[in-house]
């Protein structure tokens, strides 16, 4: 006789997901000699762990407590990038610009970016039909609880000058429900960070429009402002030529505004 | 069985560019990383780069920066190495090459090579 | 860069007796993790080199026992307890510790 199987919203757990974290593990250690020390069956079983047997709408952060032990991991404090709406220009620029790091960039970041996964409670299972959808079924998710937790633990790493990469094509630019606006702006230090520069990236081509001025960035300055920490914010106005210009600063058309 | 096959052997002008493929199978092209490197005639061994498949992010050697690019068609499962600004002292035998993983841990040796094309700059 | 130094750069071997090479690295390639990161490789004419030994000592799968390698940080030894005639080639040390990997110069084993 089948078992019910609860249908959630969304869509389910991402296909080769075992196979695919503990290869991404290895790939990891393989790429990030200093992280060498990580056993990645360990990781593997920290990670299952967090989520296996239990309901998928009932996933707190100490759950992942092990897992984020066991991925604890040094980045420079002073050389973080945020992003909000904008994961493949921040990823782009982190490429060229090695010596910054965005969270996905880190071990467990890399690990889970773009997968979805849960279980089922009391089961052993991996659900590969459905998981909760934040929205639509709840928040306490295992995929949402995951990315809150790392992120909050990243943001709080920060120190000095934190730089944040923002979409100014979107509606909101800074949106006061995405990561970045409900985890990561709460969870700067202000006895360790100074300053939260946003890049604002534009989209269209003739845009020249400066949407520092916009309300939801007059919105974020407010908020940082708050936390006594200081708030710049740059246009760059061409994405493309922003990163030529990282790869070839010493191009002599990059002299000019971006 | 894991087998990396390259393409054919190219004979091009200095200032030319070339692009070697290296066609993987028998495993799951995304889980490893892919490893270029050269080798001059009678000469030794020289590491040109990695990339990852999944993600496209990429490592070159500091003496080959700006002149080298590698890519992934993860349909075709398939890695490209492009040289651009061919000089002479670029005729070597390219190689892919991947690692194997012992237990959930990467060797740290390269396991598994393509058998090499040869690349000829010549005026 | 980790720069990797082999001895003797030929050798010349007769056929059942014991051959050995000598391969240095200007630093230590012990990692935190208890591993040491050093390869042993063989090259034969016309062909990709083919691993023989990862982490100083572990050897390759499929490789014969007679291959064996030890050291210590900087200071690496491959053995061959027996030379047959299909062990001629050249044979590069590699350090994985850290990026950029790095090879030895090369070791050619001639049979007498």
């Known amino acids: 006789v089948p078992r019910w199987r609860q249908q959630w919203s969304g869509p389910g757990t991402t296909k080769r997901f075992p196979e695919t974290v503990l290869a991404r593990c290895v790939k990891y250690t393989e790429i990030h000699p200093e992280m060498r020390h990580v056993d990645c069956q360990s990781v593997w079983d920290a990670f299952k762990g967090a989520f296996i047997s239990k309901h998928p709408c009932n996933i707190t952060e100490e759950d992942y407590q092990p897992l984020m032990k066991l991925g604890t991991q040094t980045v420079p404090c002073n050389k973080i990038l945020l992003w909000s709406r904008i994961k493949d220009l921040a990823h782009q620029f982190t490429q060229v610009q090695r010596d910054m790091f965005t969270l996905e960039d880190t071990l467990l970041g890399y690990l889970a970016d773009d997968l979805t996964w849960c279980g089922e409670f009391n089961t052993s299972k991996i659900n590969y039909q459905s998981c909760p959808d934040w929205r639509k079924d709840c928040s306490n998710n295992p995929v949402s609880v995951f990315w809150k937790t790392v992120s909050r633990r990243f943001a709080e790493a920060a120190c000095d000058v934190v730089h944040v990469m923002l979409n100014g094509s979107r509606s909101k630019i800074f949106d006061k429900n995405s990561t970045f606006g409900s985890v990561e702006v709460h969870n700067l230090q202000p006895e360790k960070v100074q300053t939260l520069e946003a890049w604002v990236i534009h989209g269209g081509r003739e845009d020249s429009r400066d949407l520092c001025q916009d309300p939801t960035i007059k919105e974020l300055e407010s908020i940082i402002s708050k936390r006594n920490i200081q708030f710049s914010c740059k246009n760059i106005y061409r994405p493309d030529k922003f990163l030529q210009c990282v790869k070839n600063p010493e191009d002599s058309s990059c002299t000019s505004e971006i | 069985q894991v087998q990396l096959v390259q393409s054919g052997a190219e004979v091009k002008k200095p200032g030319a560019s070339v692009k070697v493929s290296c066609k993987a199978s028998g495993y799951t092209f995304t889980d490893y990383i892919m490893h270029w490197v050269r080798q001059a005639p009678g000469q030794g061994l020289e590491w040109m780069g990695w990339?990852?498949?999944?993600?496209?992010?990429?490592d070159y050697a500091q003496k080959l920066q700006g002149r080298v690019t590698m890519t992934t068609d993860t349909s075709t499962s398939t890695a490209y190495m492009e040289l651009r600004s061919l000089r002479s002292d670029d005729t070597a035998v390219y190689y892919c090459?991947?690692?194997?993983?012992?237990?959930?841990?990467?060797?740290?040796?390269?396991?598994?090579w393509g058998q090499g094309t040869l690349v000829t700059v010549s005026s | 860069d980790i720069v990797m130094t082999q001895t003797p750069l030929s050798l010349s071997v007769t056929p059942g007796q014991p051959a050995s090479i000598s391969c240095q690295s200007s630093?230590?390639?012990?990692?935190?993790?208890?591993?040491?990161?050093l390869n042993w490789y063989l090259q034969k004419p016309g062909q990709p080199p083919q691993l023989l030994i990862y982490w100083m000592s572990t050897r390759a799968a499929g490789v014969p026992d007679r291959f064996s390698g030890s050291g210590s940080g900087t200071d690496f030894t491959l053995k061959i307890s027996r030379v047959e005639a299909e062990d001629v080639g050249v044979y590069y040390c590699q350090q994985f510790l850290e990026y950029p990997p790095t090879f030895g110069q090369g070791t050619k084993l001639e049979i007498k």
């Open positions: 630093e230590s390639l012990l990692h935190s993790n208890g591993k040491t990161y």
């Open positions: 090459a991947r690692v194997a993983i012992i237990t959930t841990v990467a060797s740290g040796g390269f396991a598994y």
């Open positions: 990339i990852d498949p999944e993600y496209g992010s990429t």
